[in-house]
């Protein structure tokens, strides 16, 4: 008789990434009988929630339910009804909500309360909403990319999952850039981690990892821009801010109240003789780069070496996956290729920033102007952060791999978060059975 496939025994999980600028929902799927194996979980869907990040709903929390509806309804359609009640749903909020909590714990709780009430009405196993720490965000991002790259697998493969994957079992570092924070996480080479706050110990699949991680709050691309504007307006002679980080001919009016709304600009706050100012782009990469560098305090370091702002950073080691906004921005600028050197990236950024705004708008007619206008700043910021902030060099630049997806799953903290909460990363190497009998009869 012919072997006949049994109905597949699969499990699902949902993670909502409540970021500072938007919320994304990820649906994951894995074979139930293999959940302790490495690399078996994969993403089946990403649904981007229409609208801003949840922290922006603080004055309109009654709209949160509607905001989440489309992606949650999609989940009920994509996941078989019989699996709904056993499908865990997790929501992790990141730096946008960390900033709101710094302003007011009650306001942050108010938003999360309504989020939890809204999500609990769906037929899934809702496991709560929480603000994850920067350390968790870094650690779970590191776990995600190394899980997807097969770095935790004890079997050395003769094939390569992705073009840039090295066949050795050395883990990749993780570079994550969001709107409000940025994380750097990697295993340093035989280096003691001088600052306990930055040290993580993991035992995964029978191997110990001593991991360095740090999350720089306020150094995500959006908050870094607010910081830069607040710093630069201090020395403006009037309500015109000639800004090298925007294209020549670009103009935008900014409310001073919006500028000082975020805790990230508090250190630059001053009484200004105007309520609004106008950004006028002059499109000069070099000047933009110099202005950005002023956000990094490198004059003080209580350790053998630092990134910036007195934060310990061990010497960089190995390859790094750069994802989230690192990837989105560099992808837009067409700078993700392994073959593009750091010098070439800088050269292309100089050209891009110098392009007149009218020309840019014509060339990228399909892109929203709000986003389009900020690519010059974001690209320059990424270079400044990686080179001067994290001390990558022209030589070590080739060890940075700009990654969107690995094996169809987005690089980011959500998969690692779910793997951890569902206990799918065992501390010890599971005993592997020579053959799995469960699929055929």
């Amino acid at each position: 008789t012919q072997n006949k496939a049994l109905p597949e025994n699969v499990k699902y999980g949902i993670v909502l990434d409540a970021g500072s600028s938007h919320t994304s929902l990820y649906i994951y799927k894995w074979p139930a009988e293999k959940e302790n194996d490495t690399g078996v979980v994969h993403q089946v869907e990403e649904c981007r929630v229409k609208g801003p990040g949840i922290s922006k709903f603080v004055q309109k929390v009654n709209e949160i339910g509607i905001y989440l509806t489309d992606c949650m309804e999609l989940s009920t359609e994509l996941i078989p009804t019989s699996k709904h009640h056993q499908t865990p749903v997790y929501l992790g909020a990141t730096a946008g909500m960390r900033l709101l909590r710094m302003e007011s714990e009650e306001l942050a709780d108010r938003v999360l309360d309504v989020v939890e009430r809204s999500l609990s009405n769906y037929p899934f196993d809702f496991q709560g909403a929480r603000i994850i720490t920067g350390q968790e965000e870094g650690a779970y991002g590191w776990i995600t990319i190394n899980y997807l790259l097969g770095k935790f697998s004890q079997k050395t493969r003769w094939f390569s999952i992705v073009p840039y994957e090295t066949n050795n079992q050395e883990t990749f570092g993780a570079l994550d850039l969001g709107g409000a924070s940025t994380q750097v996480t990697f295993v340093p080479q035989n280096q003691t981690i001088e600052s306990p706050d930055n040290a993580l110990q993991f035992r995964l699949y029978g191997k110990d990892y001593n991991v360095y991680t740090h999350s720089f709050l306020c150094y995500g691309k959006d908050q870094a821009l607010w910081q830069k504007l607040a710093k630069d307006i201090q020395v403006a002679s009037n309500e015109i801010l000639r800004d090298p980080c925007f294209h020549p001919g670009y103009k935008k009016v900014v409310n001073v109240s919006d500028l000082y709304k975020t805790p990230c600009t508090k250190r630059f706050e001053m009484t200004l003789p105007f309520q609004q100012f106008e950004i006028q782009g002059i499109g000069n990469y070099q000047q933009c780069h110099q202005s950005i560098l002023e956000l990094f305090n490198t004059s003080y370091c209580p350790y053998s070496q630092c990134a910036f702002n007195g934060i310990f950073l061990p010497p960089l080691q190995g390859d790094f996956g750069a994802f989230s906004a690192f990837y989105f921005v560099m992808k837009f600028l067409n700078l993700t290729s392994e073959k593009v050197s750091q010098e070439k990236v800088t050269e292309m950024m100089k050209k891009f920033c110098a392009q007149p705004w009218e020309e840019i708008k014509t060339s990228y007619a399909g892109v929203k102007e709000k986003y389009l206008s900020e690519y010059c700043f974001s690209g320059t910021y990424i270079l400044s952060l990686l080179l001067q902030g994290y001390h990558f060099t022209a030589d070590s630049w080739e060890h940075i791999h700009f990654i969107g997806k690995i094996q169809g799953s987005d690089a980011g903290w959500t998969l690692g978060y779910m793997l951890n909460l569902t206990n799918m990363i065992p501390a010890e190497q599971p005993l592997s059975t020579p053959l799995s009998h469960s699929t055929y009869v």
Epitope: G65, E116, R117
Partner: antibody, heavy 121, light 107 residues
Framework: QVQLVQSGAEVKKPGSSVKVSCKAS????????ISWVRQAPGQGLEWMGS????????NYAQKFQGRVTITADESTSTAYMELSSLRSEDTAVYYC??????????????WGQGTMVTVSS | EIVMTQSPATLSVSPGERATLSCRAS??????LAWYQQKPGQAPRLLIY???TRASGIPARFSGSGSGTEFTLTISSLQSEDFAVYYC?????????FGGGTKVEIK
């Protein structure tokens, strides 16, 4: 001191609906969640759903989803629980209770006196 | 949903003695646990919240302990008015769930 006063006992036919009210006095109504909990004769406590009057946002236990509707009227500081398609198993005392801890703290600090709902043909 | 299990179902204790009631959660609820007392014909009354904090007006003989999945309510010296049914409730996640109750009766 907050007090919750519920409407009187009801006798209902199977298939019909019942709407129980819960009026708050002596404290802030809007900000704190109001939960509804029922207790069948000789049985334990069963949470049905909750609402934050300030936002009008309700959430429900899966068991009652589609059959229960919880609403609130801020102007009269009154919460309501309507249960439809009644069956004999819905015979119980229905309590409203205030979630006293503020946002995300759902301990039930103040309870109504209870409303007996009997479903019988 | 989180399942709350109470034991024993009935506890027979003499007045003046100590009573220890247990409550177990099917997954960690941190310290988001409350204890209620219910007397016949009355609404429940909050005794303990946050696993160990006494609600206002609750006598010192009532104490709560535990965190994660294992919790205990202790009544140090039972008074006649303490004979009642006691329920634990988790409020970490929706739906809010209660234990089946422990009836404390006179021995």
């Amino acid at each position: 001191q907050v007090q919750l006063v519920q409407s009187g006992a009801e006798v209902k036919k199977p298939g019909s609906s019942v709407k129980v009210s819960c009026k708050a006095s002596g404290g802030t109504f809007s900000k704190y969640g109001i939960s509804w909990v029922r207790q069948a004769p000789g049985q334990g406590l069963e949470w049905m759903g909750s609402i934050i009057p300030e936002f009008g946002i309700a959430n429900y236990a899966q068991k009652f989803q589609g059959r229960v509707t919880i609403t609130a009227d801020e102007s009269t500081s009154t919460a309501y629980m309507e249960l439809s398609s009644l069956r004999s198993e819905d015979t119980a005392v229905y309590y409203c209770a205030r979630e006293s801890g503020g946002y995300r703290d759902h301990r039930l600090g103040v309870w109504g006196q209870g409303t007996m709902v009997t479903v019988s043909s | 949903e989180i399942v709350m299990t109470q034991s024993p179902a009935t506890l027979s204790v003499s007045p003046g003695e100590r009573a220890t009631l247990s409550c177990r959660a099917s997954q960690s609820v941190g310290s988001n646990l409350a204890w209620y007392q219910q007397k016949p014909g009355q609404a429940p009354r909050l005794l303990i919240y946050g696993a160990s904090t006494r609600a206002s007006g609750i006598p010192a003989r009532f104490s709560g302990s535990g965190s994660g999945t294992e919790f205990t309510l202790t009544i140090s010296s039972l008074q006649s008015e303490d004979f009642a049914v006691y329920y634990c409730q988790q409020y970490l996640l929706w739906p809010l769930t209660f234990g089946g109750g422990t009836k404390v009766e006179i021995k």
